[in-house]
Structures are given as structure tokens and as C-alpha cells.
């Protein structure tokens, strides 16, 4: 009879065990365990009748189609085998054990005691069949196994082979290389690869297989396993396989599909191809005169671009438009997108006008083309070029006039300072005790007229100032302070200020230049109580033209000592010139006993200590600060007076051979102007040079050469 066993383990014994088994008996045990397991069988006791080749009694172990072992007897001999310590393993999940005894037993035989168990199959070690083994990685577990793939691969639906996702490859460059996945390593199995070459219309794709070509094939059937097919429009080329690469293919199309198919077996290295776009050829190009074409090639095809540029000093001219370069392109119909332009010499055109300057052409016919040369010069003697620039400009390749130092910037013509058109006489008489100034003697002298219409009644006064540049006047702060009913320092409105330059006789202003004020700047620390920091600036609405009667004075170097004692300076003004009229009379009566013609006087600088002492001895709050110096004579007789305020006290600088403004008429008193031991007090300009330049918005270096050259 047959016994079916389905457990994972169990015991099998001969009939009647442990007693002797009966004669003429046959029992079959069919053991079935789940897939992924095999059956292990071993005997703990075995005692059967011996016979040649186990003809009488035996235990036979078999599978569906194979006898695994036949056992009998008690011990193994040449012709019979007992299991002993041997273990019988089924190759699969089924094992059949048959026990048979013949009709007679000479002795009592106790039979057998066997045990079985299901044991795991390690499929990863034991699968040798390529059709069944994992493509990349195998993972065993009790009762089964599974496969996995290397990075970049996907497990096929057969759960065994590893394929790649390669159906979405787009190539748009004009040249490129396409290979089978993992080339030159074997390509993946079970894969469908699609490569699309999509170029701009007008190009044609040429294909060439290179290096190794190794695709699984078959000796009789054309490419049944793995293959390449090339699809051009409706036409399909291929399939291709084997070890011989196809010849180069000219597709005559801008769009190509490459299909690569691999089945689930085989180890082949794959393929590599390069593709190249071909286009229509364009005619040969000739570079323009004075120009070149880049890149320079023997042949040009569709989509090739060339850049036309010109030699240094020439510009590309296309349709009357100048440019640095011009690009043309080979079109799909084999023509160029444009004609070759011409190269035209660069023209810097007419040079910019120089304020207070002239231009002379160094090149014949007043040429303004590349490498032409011009020279700027300033209107001498009233202006000179800043930093002694050469003024030479060359027409550059960029089409701009260039100077070696200034680049494309124009030079600056700075007003010459401190050089009157007439030389001042050495003999100077007595503004009290002064004399008439000849026109052009003090070309920096400015008359400042203030008419304050915001006051009731309207207030009108005047003072002097000194021209520093074409746009700026230096004067005393108290001249431009609103004549208020308190001691607050508020500047007069610029609308109330008029400046006269080149004026000689106040009765005849026709020859003078009159200008409105754009800005009135008082020194921020001007103190009405003691006239400390009595300095101010007026910016003119428009720059004034310089000439023999209108020229600036030079600013001094920054030196706290100021002018040396006993140095002689000149000061001019239209102030009170009559020594017999008192200041109080003028203030109270409103009479203007002023000079019509500009007066000037020569005065020595008084030692600071002497001046301080002279004022400290007086009643009233008179302080001579370090921002002031005094000038005049102990015996009096010569002095500046009311109305001369803000005028320049100038000293001739031997080093620069120029007149420098060292002082500004500030104050004096309380006795009358020109009184004995009443020195005129002047603002020490050298203490304010930085402040002046800052207000004028110019760096100090601009002026240094004027005074120190």
C-alpha cells in the first residue's frame, strides 16, 4: 500500500518495527514538501535480509524519474549497500520510499527506522542553468530565492533578468556618439532601447559603427535574439547583429530612430556608433579688404557661421551701419545669409570743443580718421592746462580721441591765477591813503552788491570779493550775512546778491561783467561776536569769461602761520576813501562817501602779538584769533575801511611769481579807519584752503602747481 506524507518532517518504520517485518510485504511512502525545499532522509536503524543486488528484501529511495538509492542487508558489501550514516537528499520537493520483503525470510530481520525532514534549497548556489539563474544578484531565503539588479538596471517581469530603461534618448547636437548600455561591457538582457536623433531641418544624419560590434546572433536564422534596427521615416534598415558592423549609413534625413532589442540570455559586448550631421555646402568666401573671416575653412556647410571682423582701426560697415563684427550663416539651401560687409577706416569725427581752449590738427587735411592726431591748447595767458598735460589726442581704434594720461576725457583749462595783465607799480601811495587803480591791475577784484528786499525798508550794502575761478568768489562772511536785528548768522538770499567783475569805476558798469549768485556759502563757524572764521564763498550762476580785466587770484598753500610779519601786501576796494568822514557819520546819515574808482593801498603785515596787544588795550570785546592777521602802519594813514570788506589782501609769491590771496578785509576799530595804532584785521585765508576747495568741489591738487611750481 502507499502512504502519502506532506509534513516538513517525519519518521518512517518498516512494518511491525521494532519486531521483525512480515514476509511478502510492500509499502510505499510518498513524501511531498513545498517548492524551494528538498527532502533529507537518514536511517537510525537498518537490518534487512541480505541478497545479491538486493533482489530479496530492500528499501528503494527514488524521485519521479530517478532512483536515488537501494538499500538491503546489515552492512555494506560489494553487491549490496546499507545506508549507514549516509544521508539521502532529494533533488526536488518529492521523494518516494518503497519497502519490499520477499516470500521467505531465513531469519528474523528487525527492519528499519528512518527519519526525513524538509531542508531549504540554496538556489543561488545550485542553479547552474542560465535560463533559471539570476542575471545579477541572487538572494536565498528559506523556501525560495529572489533576484535583484545592479544600480541603473530594472528587474524584468521574468523576475530573473536585468534590463535597462533606455527608450527615451534624444540627441540634438550635430555630432555625437551612441552606444549600447554599459558598452564595452556586455549589454543588459530583456531590454528595448530607443535612440532618437532629431536635428534641425536641413541637416542629414550620417551613421558609422565603430570599434567593437558584438550582438548575439544565430547561424541560420537572421538575428532572432538581439538586434539593431534603424528607422528613417517609413523605411527600416536592419536588423543588424553578429560581429560584423554594418557599412556607414547616409540616412538623407534629419530625423533617425535607432532600436536595440535584447532577449533574456547571452553575454555580448554590444556596439558603438558615431553620427554626424551633413548639410548643403555654401560658396567659398573672400575676406573684405582690411578684414578677416573666422573660422577660416576650405568648405562651409549648412549652419556654419563665420564672423567678419576688421583690422585694428577699421570698422565693419553693413548697410551704412558701423559695427565691430558681423556674423553670416550658411543656410540650408546652400546660400549665405548675407553678403560680406566692407571694412571702413574708423573716424573719430570732429573732436569735442574745449571750454576756454583751441584745437589744432596735426594731420593734413584735418583728418579725423584712425591714428590722426590733434592738439588741444588753452586760451593763454588766461587759462592753462591742468597738470601741464600735452593736450595731444590720437584717434583710437575704438573711434574716440584718446590722450595718454586722460584717456577719452578732455583736458581742463584752469584759469591762470594771480597774474594781472598789468604789473603792479612798486610805488604805492596812500584806500584811505591809497590811489586809483589802473584797469587790469586787480583783475580778481569783485564788487558784491547786496539788496535785501526781505527787509522793511529794503536794505542795501556792498563789499568786495576775489575771483578764485570762473565760477567762485571769495569774500568775508560778514558781507553776506543778513543784516539782522539780532546776532544770528543767516546768509542773505542768493537772489539778493549781484557780483560785478572787471569793474573799474562804479559809475560805469557797462564794461563790467555782472553775475547773479547760484549759491551763498558762509563758513559754518562764523561768529558775529568776534568775526572769527569771517570767510564765505559765492558761486556764480554762470562761469565768467576770463580776460585782461577778469582773472582769478591764487589761493595760498595751507599754512597756519599765514603771511610773515612785515611782508607787504596790496588790498583794493571801493570803500571809504576820505579820512575826514567818520564811520559813524556814514552809518547814521546813510551817505555813501565812497570811492567811484577802485582804490588800492600797500600795507605791511603786523606781528600777531603786537596786533593782539593793540586791541586788548581797547575797551570793548576785541579778540584777534589765530584765524586772523593784522596789517597797517603804527602811525596810521593807510588802511582799508567800511565798504572794502571781503576784499583780497594779496602778497606776491616769489616762488610761483604770482599774486596770492593771504587775507580778506574783515574788521578794525573802534577808532576811525587809518587811525594811529588801529590795524586792519584780515581773515587768514591760508587756514581755510581745504574748506574753500571742498566747497568748490575740487581736489586741492588741482591748484597746488599754480602756486608752487
Amino acid at each position: 500500500h502507499t502512504v502519502e506524507l506532506n509534513n516538513m518532517f517525519g519518521q518512517i518504520q518498516s512494518p511491525g518495527y521494532p519486531d521483525s517485518y512480515p514476509s511478502d510485504s510492500e509499502v510505499t511512502w510518498n513524501i511531498t514538501v513545498p517548492d524551494g525545499f528538498r527532502i533529507k532522509l537518514y536511517f537510525m536503524h537498518f537490518n534487512l535480509e541480505s541478497s545479491y543486488l538486493c533482489e530479496y528484501d530492500y528499501v528503494k529511495v527514488e524521485t519521479e524519474d530517478q532512483v536515488l538509492a537501494t538499500f538491503c542487508g546489515r552492512e555494506t558489501t560489494d553487491t549490496e549497500q546499507t545506508p549507514g550514516q549516509e544521508v539521502v537528499l532529494s533533488p526536488g520537493s518529492f521523494m518516494s520510499i518503497t519497502f519490499r520483503s520477499d516470500f521467505s525470510n531465513e531469519e528474523r530481520f528487525t527492519g528499519f527506522d528512518a527519519h526525513y525532514m524538509a531542508v531549504d534549497v540554496d538556489e543561488c548556489k545550485e542553479r547552474e542553468d542560465e535560463e533559471l539563474s539570476c542575471d545579477h544578484y541572487c538572494h536565498n531565503y528559506i523556501g525560495g530565492y529572489y533576484c535583484s539588479c545592479r544600480f541603473g538596471y530594472i528587474l524584468h517581469t521574468d523576475n530573473r533578468t536585468c534590463r535597462v530603461e533606455c527608450s527615451d534618448n534624444l540627441f540634438t547636437q550635430r555630432t555625437g556618439v551612441i552606444t549600447s548600455p554599459d558598452f564595452p561591457n556586455p549589454y543588459p538582457k530583456s531590454s528595448e532601447c530607443l535612440y532618437t536623433i532629431e536635428l534641425e531641418e536641413g541637416f542629414m544624419v550620417n551613421l558609422q559603427f565603430e570599434d567593437i560590434f558584438d550582438i548575439e546572433d544565430h547561424p541560420e536564422v537572421p538575428c532572432p535574439y538581439d538586434y539593431i534596427k534603424i528607422k528613417v521615416g517609413p523605411k527600416v534598415l536592419g536588423p543588424f547583429c553578429g560581429e560584423k558592423a554594418p557599412e556607414p549609413i547616409s540616412t538623407q534625413s534629419h530625423s533617425v530612430l535607432i532600436l536595440f532589442h535584447s532577449d533574456n540570455s547571452g553575454e555580448n559586448r554590444g556596439w558603438r556608433l558615431s553620427y554626424r550631421a551633413a548639410g548643403n555646402e555654401c560658396p567659398e568666401l573672400q575676406p573684405p579688404v582690411h578684414g578677416k573671416i573666422e573660422p577660416s575653412q576650405a568648405k562651409y556647410f549648412f549652419k556654419d557661421q563665420v564672423l567678419v571682423s576688421c583690422d585694428t582701426g577699421y570698422k565693419v560697415l553693413k548697410d551704412n551701419v558701423e559695427m565691430d563684427t558681423f556674423q553670416i550663416e550658411c543656410l540650408k539651401d546652400g546660400t549665405w545669409s548675407n553678403k560680406i560687409p566692407t571694412c571702413k577706416i574708423v573716424d573719430c569725427r570732429a573732436p569735442g570743443e574745449l571750454e576756454h581752449g583751441l584745437i589744432t590738427f596735426s594731420t593734413r587735411n584735418n583728418l579725423t580718421t584712425y591714428k590722426s592726431e590733434i592738439k588741444y591748447s588753452c586760451q593763454e595767458p588766461y587759462y592753462k592746462m591742468l597738470n601741464n598735460n600735452t593736450g595731444i589726442y590720437t584717434c583710437s581704434a575704438q573711434g574716440v580721441w584718446m590722450n595718454k594720461v586722460l584717456g577719452r576725457s578732455l583736458p581742463t583749462c584752469l584759469p591762470e591765477c594771480g597774474q594781472p595783465s598789468r604789473s603792479l607799480p612798486s610805488l604805492v601811495k596812500r584806500i584811505i591813503g591809497g590811489r586809483n587803480a589802473e584797469p587790469g591791475l586787480f583783475p580778481w577784484q569783485a564788487l558784491i552788491v547786496v539788496e535785501d528786499t526781505s527787509r522793511v525798508p529794503n536794505d542795501k550794502w556792498f563789499g568786495s570779493g576775489a575771483l578764485l575761478s570762473a565760477s567762485w568768489i571769495l569774500t568775508a562772511a560778514h558781507v553776506l550775512r543778513s543784516q539782522r536785528r539780532d546776532t544770528t548768522v543767516i546768509p542773505v538770499s542768493k537772489e539778493h546778491v549781484t557780483v560785478y567783475l572787471g569793474l573799474h569805476d562804479v559809475r560805469d558798469k557797462s564794461g563790467a561783467v555782472n553775475s547773479s549768485a547760484a549759491r551763498v556759502v558762509l563758513h559754518p563757524d562764523f561768529n558775529i561776536q568776534n568775526y572769527n572764521h569771517d570767510i564765505a564763498l559765492v558761486q556764480l550762476q554762470e562761469p565768467v569769461p576770463l580776460g585782461p580785466h577778469v582773472m582769478p587770484v591764487c589761493l595760498p598753500r595751507l599754512e597756519p602761520e599765514g603771511p610773515a610779519p612785515h611782508m607787504l601786501g596790496l588790498v583794493a576796494g571801493w570803500g571809504i576813501s576820505n579820512p575826514n568822514v567818520t564811520v559813524d557819520e556814514i552809518i547814521s546819515s546813510g551817505t555813501r562817501t565812497l570811492s567811484d574808482v577802485l582804490q588800492y593801498v600797500k600795507l605791511p603785515v603786523v606781528p600777531h602779538a603786537e596786533c593782539k596787544t593793540s586791541y586788548e588795550s581797547r575797551s570793548g570785546n576785541y579778540s584777534v584769533t589765530e584765524n586772523m592777521f593784522c596789517a597797517g602802519y603804527y602811525e596810521g594813514g593807510k588802511d582799508t575801511c567800511l565798504g572794502d570788506s571781503g576784499g583780497a589782501f594779496v602778497i606776491f609769491d616769489d616762488l610761483s611769481q604770482r599774486w596770492v590771496v593771504q587775507g580778506l578785509v574783515s574788521w578794525g576799530g573802534p577808532e576811525e579807519c587809518g587811525s594811529k595804532q588801529v590795524y586792519g584785521v584780515y581773515t587768514k585765508v591760508s587756514n581755510y584752503v581745504d574748506w574753500v576747495w571742498e566747497q568748490m568741489g575740487l581736489p586741492q591738487s588741482v591748484v597746488e602747481p599754480q602756486v608752487e611750481r
Epitope: R485, D486, T487, I490, S493, Q529, Y531, D584, G620, Y622
Partner: antibody, heavy 114, light 112 residues
Framework: QVQLVQSGAEVKKPGASVKVSCKAS????????INWVRQAPGQGLEWIGW????????KYNDKFKDRATLTVDTSSNTAYMELSSLRSEDTAVYYC???????WGQGTLVTVSS | DIVMTQSPDSLAVSLGERATINCKSS????????????LAWYQQKPGQPPKLLIY???TRESGVPDRFSGSGSGTDFTLTISSLQAEDVAVYYC????????FGQGTKVEIK
């Protein structure tokens, strides 16, 4: 013609602040200063401070410099005087004046009472 | 700080008579550079803002009757109404503008 028009009367509690305005017209606001003066009932004139609209310079009577703030808004030609930490003795008529006291506002009565 | 002291505190004058008010400063108001005395005189009538009469000690403001005159220099100043009119009844203040501003305590002028 020149006019200075001040804001209306105010009643404030001790410790509070008051801000009086003074709107100028008829002249260029930035060319002259604005002065503030006050007068307690039955008392004399007391100068508070001064502001110059062109550059916002200010000057104060030492007595008020910690409590008074003078400002201007040149876009509306208006000057302001703010007095903080009010006490009963700040009850007064507050005047603004311009063009060096040639023109005065009508005065603003500020009453400080609990 | 400059202190301004007016005298008398009040003054009763007959119509057409001269009225004189004095003002003394604690320091000189004469500015040596500008040669001006920074002193002003104001008139204030009840319920009205003050009115400027005199500045720089002696300069009459535009539109002020010439019966009003100012004098003095340094520290001592005087306002004179040469012939008192009914409309001149008011409180008169002096003010220094030499260093910031300070008012005198005021002088009340009445008709006798």
C-alpha cells in the same frame, strides 16, 4: 500780504504734550527764522526758541530746551512747537513770529488743568 | 544769560506829555564789529500780539509814528514817547538780541 495763522486753543492734562502749528504765507518761508514766545495770563513775554527753516537750525531758551521741540514742514510752510511734560504753569498764550518779529501769529491759548 | 530790567513797572502820563521808559542790561549789547546795539522795543495792547517799534536801539520800524524814539548804548537804553496819545496806552517791553533773546518784565503806560 504776510500772514502767520496759528492752530486753535488746547486744553491739556498735566504730564501731557501739546503741539502748536503756525502756517506762514505771503513770503518765502525758508529765507527767515520763526520765533516762539509765550505769555502767561497777566505776565510778561518769555522767549521759547528759534528755528531756521532753510537748514533746520534751532536755538532754545535754556529753560525750555529739555521740553520744547521746534520743527518745520517746508512743503506746507508750517512751523511747529511741541511742549512736553506739561504743568499748570505752562498755561499761556503761545505766539509765533517771523521776519524778525515784524509779523506775529494771533496766538494759541494752551490751558493745562487736571 | 543776559538779564533785562525795565523801570518803572508802570507809568501814568497826561495826554500830549512825554513818556520815558528805561531798560538796563546785565552786559553790553554793543557789538564792536557791526557797531550796533542789539536792543529792540515792543508795544503790546490787551488781547493782541506784541508789535515791534524800535530795533538796533534807535532804528524805528517801518510805519511806526515818529513820536516813538529809542536811544542809549552799551547797557542803558531809553524809549521815549514824545507826546503821548490815547492809542499809546499799552505795555512796553525791551528785548536784547545780542545773545539769544531776553525780554524785560514790561512797563505799563496809562493816561493820567
Amino acid at each position: 500780504q504776510v500772514q502767520l495763522v496759528q492752530s486753535g486753543a488746547e486744553v491739556k492734562k498735566p504730564g501731557a504734550s501739546v503741539k502748536v502749528s503756525c502756517k506762514a504765507s505771503g513770503y518765502t518761508f525758508t529765507t527767515d527764522d520763526i520765533n516762539w514766545v509765550r505769555q502767561a495770563p497777566g505776565q510778561g513775554l518769555e522767549w521759547i526758541g528759534w528755528i531756521y527753516p532753510r537748514d533746520d537750525r534751532t536755538k532754545y531758551n535754556d529753560k525750555f530746551k529739555d521740553r520744547a521741540t521746534l520743527t518745520v514742514d517746508t512743503s506746507s510752510n508750517t512751523a511747529y512747537m511741541e511742549l512736553s511734560s506739561l504743568r499748570s504753569e505752562d498755561t499761556a498764550v503761545y505766539y509765533c513770529s517771523s521776519l524778525e518779529d515784524t509779523y506775529w501769529g494771533q496766538g494759541t491759548l494752551v490751558t493745562v488743568s487736571s | 544769560d543776559i538779564v533785562m530790567t525795565q523801570s518803572p513797572d508802570s507809568l501814568a502820563v497826561s495826554l500830549g506829555e512825554r513818556a520815558t521808559i528805561n531798560c538796563k542790561s546785565s552786559q553790553s549789547l554793543l557789538q564792536s564789529r557791526t557797531r550796533k546795539n542789539y536792543l529792540a522795543w515792543y508795544q503790546q495792547k490787551p488781547g493782541q500780539p506784541p508789535k515791534l517799534l524800535i530795533y538796533w536801539a534807535s532804528t524805528r520800524e517801518s510805519g511806526v509814528p515818529d513820536r516813538f524814539s529809542g536811544s542809549g548804548s552799551g547797557t542803558d537804553f531809553t524809549l521815549t514817547i514824545s507826546s503821548l496819545q490815547a492809542e499809546d496806552v499799552a505795555v512796553y517791553y525791551c528785548k536784547q538780541s545780542y545773545n539769544l533773546y531776553t525780554f524785560g518784565q514790561g512797563t505799563k503806560v496809562e493816561i493820567k
